[in-house]
């Protein structure tokens, strides 16, 4: 009751920093759990366009913000040009897929790839054919698609001409998009996916300045950013509800990225509150207005008075449950650099499995697919990446402790990523990929690695067996 | 160091208008609100309202609405409040402070500017 | 508006004596007060924000807590230093109040 009093938020998931065995969801006496997933669990792999395609302006592809940013901030990165060049080498990722033998593939679409200046007329032939095909491969081998419509590379033309995000014009200019993706390949998708990680594209792109569009200082930029994604997610969601679901049957969410922490001092309820704000001020900040009560948390609205636009009482009721699943992003995008305000000088940790629990608690236990998770190694490590198995198999552990221990509905994971690509601010100097593309070749072989070998066993055994 | 320096003492008369500094340095400037904040002879402390110096956006109380400008000029980071159609009871010290987002508090504070209002 | 009510509006203390004050908002503003110290002549400092959080470099013999209406703040050995006038402020609600302030001084 104190906790509740205090700390001021409306969820649950302070508890889960009470270390009150009474109290806490998450029973620590389970350090590893040699278990199996629940049957049919969706085990799958992702990548990112901007990441893996390359030719970023070959067959009448427009450039992206991302495109500009790399030519303009990024020293010693001549451009996304060479990548594992997907684009190009399409059979390559299909052979790879079939190889780990996942349940579904999450990729996405490349917006200015189909429409080069971002406005939706006639689509660019070479990109939707690119896409149909792969689609039309991934059906045939029973791999489902889960697309995703934005993953940060928006049409520069967009973001010269409005501004990008910052300008609401672009809320129907990106439900255009969305509509004719629904229309062209909502037949073969039946998991969509509009936006990776708009904390992210707030945070980094209108505050750091460590991703595109790179400005930065500006807060009031970021939260009128995070505000456009998350009206342009409602709206698409709504679209998407009202005219394709009917007939395509599919689900619909947006994927959130998270850090997670713990408390200097674990009795100490203060420190328990900055976690809690911690969480709030990341996570919350999106999950809130879609899984929660269609508004920003609370403390948000105490503190960025000046700055955090207000969701009128009618778009409270429009943002308020537009996701069919909650789809959960845990990775180093959201710990390294982390955002010093969200450390509330705190414990940065890895738990998986005690964010998935804050999720269950402050989002009224909502089915959850982890959409990206894994870690990184240095751009030197080749095929023998035992530092990724390890991180793997922790993460896993904790997907699995969530489920059996916890009750937490976890019913797909995606590990990221097919293959080594272009990462963001870190360039080329990390590797993420279960596959090695040594970028300086001609033909960009897929190679696997220990991981790929590994996660290949997890799916076959649908878990860890003794 | 954060330090937030401002504008000598003013005499006014009724009817005029003032307009306060406060120089910031020790920071970025344009990544946090400047508040204003002002305390009369022997009264306790009252807001005015708000100035985000990268967009230039403000937000005051009711009570200075229509009397008060908050301005900036970005290059010499510098925040201004202009206070027009003085009374006497506008007679007391103008503070500026800067707004901490994760706290939701003045973290730092200038020294203060006395302004008298006397015919 | 909200309005915050401080008291008691003066106190004499002895250096080492346990000093509390209490702060009441006119309506629940949860977690959402600071605390500030103010000399004369000086700039207004911040000892605590959101209800106990010390401010870096503040020291610990200052202390905040309640929730909700209620409220104190709390200096556990009362220092020749800490001779000021103490205010609480709350930001639930625009525009940010202030309480009356409560003076300090050594007897």
């Known amino acids: 009751i104190l906790l509740r009093a205090v700390t001021g938020f409306s969820g649950d998931g302070r508890a889960i920093w009470s270390k009150n065995p009474n109290f806490t969801p998450v029973n620590e006496s389970q350090l590893f759990l040699y278990d199996t997933f629940p049957k049919n669990f969706f085990w799958g792999i992702g990548t990112g366009a901007l990441q893996v395609e390359g030719s970023w302006k070959k067959d009448g592809k427009g450039p992206s913000i991302w495109d500009h940013f790399i030519h303009t901030h990024l020293k010693n990165v001549s451009s996304t040009n060479g990548s594992s060049d997907s684009y190009i080498f399409l059979e390559k990722d299909l052979s790879a897929l079939d190889f780990i033998g996942v349940s579904f593939y999450q990729f996405s679409i490349s917006w200015p790839r189909l429409f080069p200046d971002g406005i939706v007329t006639v689509a660019n032939a070479k990109g939707l054919q690119y896409y149909s095909t792969l689609l039309d491969a991934l059906v045939l081998r029973n791999i489902e698609p889960i697309v995703t419509l934005y993953h940060w590379d928006l049409p520069l033309a967009l973001q010269e001409k409005y501004g990008g995000w910052k300008n609401d014009t672009i809320i129907d200019i990106f439900n255009d998009y969305a509509t004719y993706c629904f229309q062209m390949f909502g037949d073969r998708v039946k998991y969509w996916i509009t936006i990776h990680n708009p904390y992210l594209v707030a945070w980094h792109g209108y505050g750091t300045g460590m991703h595109a569009p790179g400005e930065k200082g500006n807060l009031a930029a970021v939260y009128t950013v995070g505000h456009n994604l998350i009206k342009a997610h409602s709206k698409v969601w709504h679209n998407y509800n009202t005219h394709f679901r009917p007939h395509q049957k599919g689900w619909l969410s947006i994927t959130l990225g998270s850090h997670w922490i713990e408390p200097n001092r674990s009795e100490n309820t203060m420190d328990i509150f900055k976690c809690q704000q911690s969480m709030v001020s990341v996570l919350g900040w999106f999950a809130n207005p879609i899984h929660g009560d269609g508004d920003y948390p609370e403390g948000m609205r105490k503190k960025l008075f000046s700055v955090l636009p207000i969701f009128s009482e009618a778009e409270k009721h429009e943002m308020r449950g537009t996701a069919d699943f909650f789809a959960f992003s845990f990775g180093p995008n959201n710990f390294k650099p982390l955002n010093t305000m969200a450390k509330m000088g705190q414990n940065v940790s890895l738990n998986l499995r005690e964010a998935l629990n804050w999720i269950k608690l402050e989002y009224n236990n909502p089915r959850i697919l982890i959409a990206e998770n894994g870690w990184f190694t240095d751009s030197r490590v080749k095929t023998e990446d035992t530092t990724a198995i390890y991180m793997m198999k922790n993460f896993l552990s904790q997907v699995l402790q969530a489920i059996r221990l916890d009750e937490i509905r976890v019913f797909g994971y995606t590990a990221w990523s097919l293959l080594d690509g272009f990462e963001w601010q870190d360039a080329y100097t990390i590797r993420r990929g279960l596959f090695y593309v040594d970028f300086n070749s001609k033909q960009k072989e897929r190679k696997p690695k220990s991981s790929a070998h590994y996660y290949k066993q997890i799916i076959r055994e649908n878990g860890f067996s003794l | 160091q954060v330090q937030l320096v401002q504008s000598g003492a003013e005499v006014k008369k009724p009817g005029a208008s003032v307009k306060v500094s406060c120089k910031a340095s020790g920071y970025t400037f344009t990544s946090y609100d400047i508040n204003w904040v002002r305390q009369a002879t022997g009264q306790g402390l009252e807001w005015m309202g708000w100035?985000?110096?990268?967009?230039?956006?403000?937000g005051y109380a009711q009570k200075f609405q229509g009397r008060v400008t908050m301005t900036r000029d970005t290059s010499i980071n510098t925040a201004y409040m202009e206070l027009s159609s003085l009374r006497s009871e506008d007679t007391a010290v103008y503070y500026c402070?800067?707004?901490?987002?994760?706290?939701?508090?003045?973290?730092?504070w200038g020294q203060g500017t006395m302004v008298t209002v006397s015919s | 508006d909200i309005q915050m009510a401080q008291s008691p509006s003066s106190l004499s203390a002895s250096v080492g004596d346990r000093v509390t004050i209490t702060c009441q908002a006119s309506q629940d503003i949860s977690i959402y007060l600071n605390w500030y110290q103010l000399k004369p002549g000086k700039a207004p400092k911040l000892l605590i924000y959101?209800?106990?959080n010390l401010e870096t470099g503040v020291p610990s013999r200052f202390s905040g807590g309640g929730s909700g209406t209620d409220f104190t703040f709390t200096i556990s050995s009362l220092q020749p230093e800490d001779i000021a006038t103490y205010y609480c402020?709350?930001?639930?609600?625009?525009?940010?109040?202030f309480g009356p302030g409560t003076k300090v001084d050594i007897k």
């Open positions: 100035m985000n110096p990268h967009s230039g956006n403000t």
């Open positions: 402020q709350q930001y639930d609600n625009l525009p940010l109040t």
């Open positions: 402070a800067k707004y901490n987002w994760n706290y939701g508090a003045f973290d730092f």
């Open positions: 959101d209800v106990s």
